[in-house]
Amino acid sequence: MMTGTIETTGNISAEKGGSIILQCHLSSTTAQVTQVNWEQQDQLLAICNADLGWHISPSFKDRVAPGPGLGLTLQSLTVNDTGEYFCIYHTYPDGTYTGRIFLEVLESSVAEHGARF
């Protein structure tokens, strides 16, 4: 039976050109995490495998950094990075748990304006 739950940072926003940490945490289970995938709906960003280590997709190689932990750091953000990101925890013996984070990348001026009000 799958008893675990994924906790995520939920909806987050960041400034264009900046960076953001995508982080998920699996709790309430003793299952062993053997692999974590970071994906968008149409493509894989990165995989952290317990035996193989990190794999970063060539499409993101220049601006994705592994970690901290099983998380992922996105750098040099663009407005096109706005969207949903999925952390997919492969575990034994439970199976697969999925969490989601919605990232909104704001134009610098919009972010600054927002801070003034």
């Epitope: 709906q41 995989i47 997919i88």
Partner: antibody, heavy 118, light 107 residues
């Protein structure tokens, strides 16, 4: 339990538009996942055609160029495929399927054969 | 697009045999590969995802291995119901592509 069921004409004339619908029961197509069309010509392999995600965004196989459109009717919990300018090469069994996380296909319809012939 | 090349295209074996089917990706897909079984007149059935993870309800005689570009599906002891066609699929990015299939026949 999630179930998918394809429906539509089994015969389409060359140059016309093929239209199929997938009716999903046991799960709302606006709740999660991406909803796909995959086809298989007789005696051949599988070809992913595209999907519409639960949020309504679509992705298509570039090999089909601009001939393919996937849309949805949320009130009926259905999603649809349109393939324009069909030829005999488009004769295939057409499957609808749900994409999981990661992007595997665990739930499929039973498939419907569409023949393109005059 | 990422191409998936399966071998062999057909294979004859007997009940109780151990058989392996291989799949080669045209570029590094890490562990983003799934395997399916298809019987005539039926939709494909998911067996393995992420190269080595058995899907719910799949018998443990089916196992997957590999990473990078080379992947293997192994059936440890063939049962009569295992004679079918098997496909690999990468789930790395769109467009998702499948191997051309391996038809497993009774010897």
């Amino acid at each position: 339990q999630v179930q998918l069921q394809e429906s539509g004409p089994g015969l389409v004339k060359p140059s016309q538009t093929l239209s199929l619908t997938c009716t999903v029961t046991g799960y709302s197509i606006t709740s999660d996942y991406a909803w796909n069309w995959i086809r298989q010509p007789p005696g051949k392999g599988l070809e992913w055609m595209g999907y519409i995600s639960y949020s309504g965004s679509a992705r298509y196989n570039p090999s089909l160029k601009s001939r393919v459109t996937i849309s949805r009717d949320t009130s009926k919990n259905q999603f649809s495929l349109k393939l324009s300018s069909v030829t005999a090469a488009d004769t295939a069994v057409y499957y609808c399927a749900r994409k999981g996380y990661p992007a595997y296909f665990a739930y499929w319809g039973q498939g419907t054969l569409v023949t393109v012939s005059s | 697009d990422i191409q998936m090349t399966q071998s062999p295209s057909s294979l004859s074996a007997s009940v109780g045999d151990r058989v392996s089917i291989t799949c080669k990706a045209s570029q590094d897909v890490s562990t983003a590969v799934a395997w399916y079984q298809q019987k005539p007149g039926q939709a494909p059935r998911l067996l393995i995802y992420s190269a080595s993870y058995r899907y719910t309800g799949v018998p443990d005689r089916f196992s997957g291995s590999g990473s990078g570009t080379d992947f293997t599906l192994t059936i440890s002891s063939l049962q009569p119901e295992d004679f079918a066609t098997y496909y690999c699929q990468h789930h790395y990015s769109t467009p998702y592509t499948f191997g051309q299939g391996t038809k497993l026949e009774i010897k």
